[in-house]
């Protein structure tokens, strides 16, 4: 099908566009280009007749068009009015008409934009600023960049006027950034120079540093004040309400106890007209004080909270030391010390982090220790444990179940039978039980501090008759000489004897057989293929006995060294060679053959008809067991003699 492709589709004014023809028929009378979506002689641009090789300009020809032999049309020095559709009309040599329409769009090259602003010095939390991207251009898209990133999503940022205007409501200091606007159309993109927004703010509440408020007599006091402010703040110092000096720093050498008091820093911004003050209380000690530990969380929750222990007071030029459980701090990624060692942070506390914790202040002569602090870590409850572990009881006995779950504070317990609440105690006691007491016994442990609850369910069966037991195994397909297997007789029942049989016989004495867990568990170490037998367990008490169904142990073994049969190694020429390979293995192995090292077939039997001396060589059988991951092989030499050359040779199969 005849098609027109515009290259490019979007054309810049002054540039050129090629209307490229695809699938032009081979035998042509001629072709003609028209402006618009149909053949219209009044809008013909140019035509070409093959026979005369003559191009004829039409009424719509502008002198900027060039027609090519392949019918493609080049339009140069594009103007806005060239936008639109163009139709190619092709007359084939059999005078059959065909036409196709293409189109392109013309856009101007954009000028470099600039940003105008309605407020050059807005005040934080008070003013709005409107940036406008100049000039206004038709068919252009406007984009904005903040610090060379696209606009963040914010309710304080609003685009309007076709995205030409960016308004920042209630400006903040964080709006102090480089702003650029960009104009785009399909043929060009231009960015403005950046405009830096200068937001007036502050002063914020000043910060006095250093933070320590305790000093020793004889030290120098050097306080610095800083408040975030634009333009930068002017500072004043007051001691106990009395003005001292208009500087950012306050220096008092060789302080004494008399220098204790309230120190006020005042910050003033002359443009915003705002003042802010901060007061710090300085204490000058004659001797270093006894340290003490403060905690940011007195009841942290295990695996959730972090705890920051801080050694007080803060004293300049002092070494802080820490001990846990009367030992120096262990190396742990969960223990972090601040730069000055004053704060010890325990990340994601556990129940083992209770302590005690001590901190110390080292002076020239000694180390002063704080009193020990113990952390009260809230944890649990863990999954409750119901004891005893029996699940079968005889009628008439007393049922006494106890529940315990690790928890801080200690858990509150509830018992449910078959989903019905019974009592809020840690122990459940039912005397003289009957079959009706069989059911699901649920213990629920609740930690009131963490709000967490955990439950454990136990099935209790009250029956004079013991149930038919069953055998569970920890390994259904053990590998010979490698794996151990543990059989457990289920269920666990009170006052019950457990017995075992192998192939209907009582257990043989073997160092590889071991009974444990009140004879309930039978462990076979280093299983062998001879252990692939029927195992039965039995339970009995004073009134009944029962045996399980047999469980046959499926031991994976092999492959053993294979055997090639027949054993003959000498054959007469012309005989059939029929070699069979066998290896003891569970599961059955995969077989493959190699003759003189060259792989042959993956079969158990190798058959070669009418052998000749060319069949002399080494015949190797390879066996592999995918289940055990083991391999084995054997090599046999075969000699083939020419017929009648040597007596006693096998005639083959």
């Amino acid at each position: 099908k005849l098609t027109i492709e515009s290259t490019p589709f979007n054309v810049a004014e002054g540039k050129e566009v090629l209307l490229l023809v695809h699938n032009l028929p081979q035998h042509l009378f001629g072709y003609s280009w028209y402006k618009g979506e149909r053949v219209d002689g009044n809008r013909q641009i140019i035509g070409y007749v093959i026979g005369t090789q003559q191009a004829t300009p039409g009424p719509a020809y502008s002198g900027r068009e060039i027609i090519y032999p392949n019918a493609s049309l080049l339009i140069q020095n594009i103007i806005q009015n060239d936008t639109g559709f163009y139709t190619l009309h092709v007359i084939k040599s059999d005078l059959v008409n065909e036409e196709a329409t293409g189109q392109f769009r013309v856009y101007p090259e954009l000028p470099k934009p600039s940003i105008s602003s309605n407020n050059s010095k807005p005040v934080e939390d008070k003013d709005a600023v409107a940036f406008t991207c100049e000039p206004e251009t038709q068919d252009a898209t406007y984009l904005w960049w903040v610090n060379n990133q696209s606009l963040p999503v914010s309710p304080r940022l609003q685009l309007s006027n076709g995205n030409r205007t960016l308004t920042l409501f209630n400006v903040t200091r964080n709006d102090t950034a480089s702003y650029k606007c960009e104009t785009q159309n399909p043929v060009s993109a231009r960015r403005s120079d950046s405009v830096i927004l200068n937001v007036l703010y502050g002063p914020d509440a000043p910060t006095i540093s250093p933070l320590n408020t305790s000093y020793r007599s004889g030290e120098n006091l050097n306080l610095s004040c800083h408040a975030a402010s634009n333009p930068p703040a002017q500072y004043s110092w007051f001691v106990n309400g009395t003005f001292q000096q208009s500087t950012q720093e306050l220096f008092i050498p060789n302080i004494t106890v008399n220098n204790s008091g309230s120190y006020t820093c005042q910050a003033h911004n002359s443009d915003t007209g705002l003042n802010r003050t901060t007061v710090t209380t300085i204490t000058v000690y004659a001797e270093p004080p006894k340290p003490f530990i403060t905690s940011n969380n007195s009841n942290p929750v295990e695996d959730e909270d972090a705890v920051a222990l801080t050694c007080e007071p803060e004293i300049q030029n002092t070494t802080y030391l820490w001990w846990v459980n009367n030992q120096s701090l262990p190396v742990s990624p969960r223990l972090q010390l601040s730069n000055d060692n004053r704060t010890l942070t325990l990340l994601s506390v556990t129940r083992n982090d209770v302590g005690p914790y001590e901190c110390g202040i080292q002076n020239e002569l000694s180390v002063d220790h704080s009193d020990p602090v113990i952390l009260n870590v809230l944890y649990g409850p863990d999954d409750p444990t119901i004891s005893p572990s029996y699940t079968y009881y005889r009628p008439g006995v007393n049922l006494s179940l106890s529940c315990h779950a690790a928890s801080n504070p200690p858990a509150q317990y509830s018992w449910l039978i078959d989903g019905n609440i019974q009592q809020h105690t840690q122990e459940l006691f039912i005397s003289n039980i009957t079959e009706k007491n069989s059911g699901l016994y649920t213990c629920q442990a609740n930690n009131s501090a963490s709000g967490h609850s955990r439950t454990t369910v136990k099935t209790i069966t009250v029956s004079a008759e013991l149930p038919k037991p069953s055998i569970s195994s920890n390994n259904s397909k053990p590998v010979e000489d490698k794996d151990a297997v543990a059989f457990t007789c289920e269920p666990e029942a009170q006052n019950t004897t457990y017995l075992w049989w192998v192939n209907g016989q009582s257990l043989p004495v073997s160092p590889r057989l071991q009974l444990s867990n009140g004879n309930r568990t039978l462990t076979l170490f280093n299983v062998t293929r001879n252990d692939a037998r029927a195992y039965v367990c039995g339970i009995q008490n004073s009134v009944s006995a029962n045996r399980s169904d047999p469980v046959t142990l499926d031991v994976l073994y092999g492959p053993d060294t294979p055997i090639i049969s027949p054993p003959d190694s000498s054959y007469l020429s012309g005989a059939n060679l029929n070699l069979s390979c066998h290896s003891a293995s569970n599961p059955s192995p995969q077989y493959s053959w190699r003759i003189n090292g060259i792989p042959q077939q993956h079969t158990q039997v190798l058959f070669i008809a009418k052998i000749t001396p060319n069949n002399n060589g080494t015949y190797a059988c390879f066996v592999s067991n995918l289940a055990t991951g083991r391999n084995n092989s054997i090599v046999k030499s075969i000699t083939v003699s020419a017929s009648g050359t040597s007596p006693g040779l096998s005639a083959g199969a």
Epitope: H27, F29, G30, Y31, S32, R38, V39, D40, G41, N42, Q44, G47, Y48, V49, G51, T52, Q54, T56, H89, I91, S93, D94, L95, V96, N97, E99
Partner: antibody, heavy 121, light 106 residues
Amino acid sequence: EVQLLESGGGLVQPGGSLRLSCAASGFTFSSSYMGWVRQAPGKGLEWVSSIGSGSYSTSYADSVKGRFTISRDNSKNTLYLQMNSLRAEDTAVYYCARYPSVPFPPHFDYWGQGTLVTVSS
Amino acid sequence: DIQMTQSPSSLSASVGDRVTITCRASQSISSYLNWYQQKPGKAPKLLIYAASSLQSGVPSRFSGSGSGTDFTLTISSLQPEDFATYYCQQAGNPHTFGQGTKLEIK
């Protein structure tokens, strides 16, 4: 001046044959597409056949396909229409016409004066 | 094949009248339509090609319009020499003619 002169018309029996000629002058015949159009007595115009400048491309109306053959001899500036198996309904004035060598949908810009073909027993 | 239907088949008018003849194609033929004038005993004469292009030497009172399936030949002010039969022809394949419209003096 462009001139097209048809000849070869006349009376012929049904089933008979006739060969029409069109002598061309006043233009470059060898590069022009040509055609035949007929007009039955008292009826409208009916396009019959067209031929390309080099005889490679020919086309026919369904009513004459297989019976009429269009051809040309560029060395003699002559267009031909060989008419076989003539029928009574082929009776008409046969016009020779030229397609102009312009890249517009096909049209006839010059016509001959016509030659009458009568098919009757 | 594409059928061409002219209407009216005949029409009476006076000198100076504005006359319109229409031609309808049985399917779209883009702008591939020509108009011819034929006087009795004479060969046809090309008036309009490609639906709206006036053939060189044809008076400007003749004009053509339309595209797709509906086309019109208009004579803006009828002259004595314009009384004749007018044929439309589609320039597709085959080059079918309309049945003709006879323009007579009223």
